[in-house]
């Protein structure tokens, strides 16, 4: 009896055993097949070719006061994905802006050097021959070619013949407009800041970056010349010369632009030493807008060097005149109002000079000479309300130049003398200029870098040029990288899993299933 | 109407100086950049020198440059050479002329002359 | 310097002809040629600026064309009144003018 028992026991602990095996091995295998055909739909969707082939780009931004190299880089399969552009370098070439140069350009050559052999550097050889170099001239080569079409010719034959020496791919250089240089800029950031994607996020990597996809207003501040860009609440413009139509990424977008030549921070206060010198008593200019105790000799022939000066051109009688600094924010406010024509608009509203500006929409990136300024002022948070700008604007100004110099022992004097007529500029031109208000202060953020990339237009060039930005919104891969490397490495440990279930199973002693039963 | 006349040639003894001036009037005189511009009797044209509207190009032809000297006085709407160092070989008509636009930007080309003065530099 | 080269030196032209004045550079001038016509006891006229663009008070008879190093200017039909010298002149270096084309009348 004892035998059979044992015998029966054996067929049933079999029976249960076969009857496991079946289930189990039904299971893991429609998890290895679900999980093979997983890793075969995600790999070939995804379609990501390894090693990743990387695209470079150059733009030199040919400022009014510097000129500036920056090197983009970019993964080849991606290009027409928002924000995979990325900045690795920028190079500030060593004196001033190229039409400095209109009497010596000879020296053109040598001036571009340094920075050209940077990015020789950092761009592998293998590359040089495909990155596109470019050069795009602002409000500085502007106010020359006002003087002559050909001597800013000249110069920008000078540039070419440099450039085109480099082993890159040389693509050429000219004037951009102004209307270019505020659209470049709005494509810039709001391309950073991720507003042209489609997608949703599952996190936000970029400090400025909403849900929503509100493109940011541009505002951008140069040496000659400052922009202001954004899609305005209403549609139809009053100024046609002001409009643009964009398609990007399958949307549509009617944007304002104006840029305002002679209006740039070093213009600015040119144009401003130019009006108040005309009342000057004397070869003596007591200025609200410089430190107290501050003294510089300015030569007349330098004051009239520029057109932007022309209207307050006049015979003095002195051909030096010395600036004596009595840091004085109101005053230096009042004589900087003084630039803006408000009194004449043809339009519902203008900024000023007569020039349309419709109400102002959104949040606004405030770059350049915007955030260098105000970032040294220490006055780019967030928190930090317009009369606490004013302020601290007010007490800065009225600091004594001895004491300012002490502070900061390693700025060079001329700028750091001219950051009070800077800020005061700044509100300025943001309060009266462009009709801020201490409510709307808060929509206006400083930025400086956008996940690495400086805020300007010369990654919105470079885009537009290569082609990046698309109009239609592109057949993109349908996963983000992080979630196809989430999902190719859940689906591998499913396998694993599977795997070693399989073994553990078919290579355990019979004791094992005796546990099970 | 654009009007450019030319004052202060003569004769003059080698090595000797003299300053040419010209009046402007019918324009916005600071708008535009101007030049001389010489004539031997007889012979072709020569550009002896420019500055420009606001004065960031100033530029001489070879056989003048460290002997001439061009300079603008925009509120008084005039242009001048001052000629040091004169040579028997700088005796010429010296033209006043406004440099051309080519729409909003400056040309360097000639677009109105004056009837010139005339130098005669010989002892 | 640029060198302005032109030819033929001096042409007589019978009224309602046609007249070709031609102008080489001895390096590339872009588009930045320009041409005077100076009639004798009076300063130069301008008659075509940028190569090809005719000075306003200037008959349409006139015409300019070329780029870079050749350039030619034309008179179609040629006129009494067209009797003079005419330069050219570029701008793309500090200026230099042609010797002159003197232009005579049949």
């Known amino acids: 009896m004892k035998g059979t028992k044992d015998l029966t026991s054996q067929q049933k602990e079999s029976n249960v055993k076969t009857f496991c095996s079946k289930n189990i091995l039904a299971i893991l295998g429609f998890s290895s097949i679900i999980a093979v055909i997983a890793l075969l739909a995600v790999g070939l969707t995804q379609n990501k070719a390894l090693p990743e082939n990387i695209k470079y780009g150059i733009v030199l931004d040919a400022g009014s006061s510097h000129t500036s190299l920056y090197i983009y880089k970019w993964p080849a399969e991606k290009e027409n994905d928002t924000g995979v552009v990325h900045q690795v370098e920028e190079c500030r070439v060593k004196g001033p802006g190229i039409s400095k140069y209109v009497q010596k350009v000879n020296e053109i050559g040598i001036y571009l050097t340094d920075c050209m052999e940077r990015a020789r550097e950092v761009i592998p050889r293998s590359q040089h021959q495909e990155t596109p170099v470019y050069l795009g001239a602002t409000a500085g080569m502007r106010l020359l070619r006002m003087e002559s079409e050909e001597l800013a010719d000249r110069v920008l034959d000078v540039v070419e013949r440099s450039l085109s020496n480099y082993p890159f791919d040389f693509q050429g250089a000219r004037i951009i407009t102004g209307q270019e240089e505020g659209a470049y800029g709005w494509i810039t950031i709001n391309y950073l800041l991720g507003k042209f994607s489609q997608k949703t996020r599952w996190f936000s990597i970029v400090p400025y970056e909403t849900n929503n996809q509100e493109t940011f207003g541009a505002l951008d501040l140069g040496g000659a010349s400052t922009q202001i860009t954004f899609v305005p609440q209403n549609q139809t413009t009053e100024s046609p010369d002001n409009a643009l139509q964009f398609r990007l990424y399958g949307k549509d977008y009617n944007v304002y632009t104006h840029s305002f030549l002679c209006y740039g921070k070093d213009q600015a206060l040119w144009q401003k030493l130019a009006k108040d010198i005309q009342v000057a008593s004397n070869e003596i200019l007591r200025d609200p807008c410089f430190h107290p105790g501050y003294k510089k000799v300015v030569n007349v022939s330098d004051l009239y060097k520029t057109p932007c000066t022309k209207r307050f051109e006049m015979t003095l009688p002195f051909q030096q005149f010395e600036i004596q600094g009595i840091g004085n924010y109101q005053q230096c406010h009042q004589s900087v109002l003084e630039l803006f024509n408000t009194s004449y608009c043809p339009y519902s509203q203008c900024a000023f000079n007569g020039i349309f500006l419709p109400p102002l929409q959104g949040d606004f990136g405030a770059f350049s000479a915007f955030y260098f300024v105000m970032n040294f002022l220490n006055l780019t948070s967030e928190k930090v309300s317009q009369e606490k700008v004013t302020e601290m604007m007010k007490k800065f100004c009225s600091q004594p130049w001895e004491e300012i110099k002490t502070s900061y022992a390693g700025v060079k004097e001329k700028y750091l003398s001219e950051y009070c007529f800077s800020g005061t500029y700044i509100l300025s031109l943001l309060l009266q200029g462009y009709h801020f208000t201490a409510d709307s202060w808060e929509h206006i953020h400083f930025i400086g870098k956008i996940q690495g990339s400086d805020a300007g237009w010369t990654l919105g060039y470079m885009l537009n040029l290569t082609n990046m930005i698309p109009a239609e919104q592109p057949l993109s891969t349908p996963l983000s990288h992080s979630t196809y490397v989430f999902l190719m490495v859940l689906f591998s440990l499913v396998l694993v899993i599977v795997a070693i279930i399989g073994l553990l199973i078919f290579h355990k002693p019979s004791y094992f299933w005796k546990d099970m039963v | 109407e654009v009007q450019l006349v030319e004052s202060g040639g003569g004769l003059v003894q080698p090595g000797r100086s003299l300053r040419l001036s010209c009046a402007a009037s019918g324009f916005t005189f600071n708008n535009y950049g101007m030049n001389w511009v010489r004539q031997a009797p007889g012979k072709g044209l020569e550009w002896v020198s420019s500055f420009s509207s606001s004065s960031t190009y100033i530029s001489y032809a070879d056989t003048v440059k460290g002997r001439f000297t061009i300079s603008r006085d925009n509120a008084k709407n005039s242009l001048y050479l001052q000629m040091n160092s004169l040579r028997a070989e700088d005796t010429a008509l010296y033209y006043c002329?406004?440099?051309?636009?080519?729409?909003?930007?400056?040309?360097?080309?000639?677009?109105?002359w004056g009837q010139g003065t005339m130098v005669t530099v010989s002892s | 310097d640029t060198v302005l080269t032109q030819s033929p030196a001096s042409l007589a032209v019978s009224p309602g002809q046609r007249a070709t004045i031609t102008c080489r550079a001895s390096e590339g001038v872009k588009s930045y040629m320009h041409w005077y016509q100076q009639k004798p006891g009076q300063p130069p006229k301008l008659l075509i600026y940028k190569a090809s663009n005719l000075a306003s008070g200037v008959p349409a008879r006139f015409s300019g064309s070329g780029s870079g190093t050749d350039f030619t200017l034309t008179i179609n039909p040629v006129e009494a009144d067209d009797t003079a010298n005419y330069y050219c002149q570029q701008s793309w270096n500090d200026p230099t003018f042609g010797q002159g084309t003197k232009l005579e009348i049949k």
């Open positions: 002329a406004r440099h051309g636009r080519y729409g909003g930007y400056g040309g360097f080309y000639f677009d109105y």
